[in-house]
Interface confidence: low
């Protein structure tokens, strides 16, 4: 039975050219996290594997930085980065948990950053 819940930074906005931290946190379960995937729509951005560590997709390696924690830092934002991002937690024995974050990249210099938290 899957008892866990995913907390995320929710809907966030950031300025074009800036950076933002995407964060998810899995709570209310004792399941072991074996891997976390970060995806943007259907594109894989990064993987953090319990045995192999971080892997950043080659097409994003110049603009995506790992961490902090299981989070992901997006840099040099463009308006094309606007959209849905998913953190996919692979766990044992529970299975897969998915969290959703919507990022809006604004041209304006008055972009309001959503609440951000760090793990642990």
């Amino acid at each position: 039975m899957m008892t866990g819940t995913i907390e995320t930074t929710g809907n966030i906005s950031a300025e074009k050219g800036g950076s933002i931290i995407l964060q998810c946190h899995l709570s209310s379960t004792t399941a072991q996290v074996t891997q976390v995937n970060w995806e943007q729509q259907d594109q894989l951005l990064a993987i953090c594997n319990a045995d192999l560590g971080w892997h950043i997709s080659p097409s994003f390696k110049d603009r995506v930085a790992p961490g902090p924690g299981l989070g992901l830092t997006l840099q040099s934002l463009t308006v094309n980065d606007t959209g849905e991002y998913f953190c996919i937690y692979h766990t044992y024995p529970d299975g897969t948990y998915t969290g959703r974050i919507f990022l809006e990249v604004l041209e304006s210099s008055v972009a309001e950053h959503g609440a951000r938290f760090q793990i642990p």
Partner: nanobody, 116 residues
Framework: EVQLVESGGGLVQPGGSLRLSCAAS????????MGWFRQAPGKEREWVAS???????WYADSVKGRFTISADNSKNTAYLQMNSLKPEDTAVYYC??????????WGQGTLVTVSS
Amino acid sequence: EVQLVESGGGLVQPGGSLRLSCAASGTTFSSAAMGWFRQAPGKEREWVASVLRGGYTWYADSVKGRFTISADNSKNTAYLQMNSLKPEDTAVYYCARDPVELGDYWGQGTLVTVSS
């Protein structure tokens, strides 16, 4: 069995420096990140800094520009160089693999006291 041993703590005056070390045995951190964490009296443990294979580093805002994290994978050791120390840096400092969600092994910690 995984063992982490932190060392290098002590009493230092405000503005002073310390270098902490974390030696790991029974595992290797070369394929993951190493993190330093701290726990002040009466507070929850908080993340301080992390270093990824290849040297990428990131820091908590409270220590940015003052602390430097590094790792020597050949020695399986992580370091935390702490400069311009403040009384609020007083805490027990721990190292662990980061993200800790992927297997949280903790050592006994090393106490850093910043006081005049």
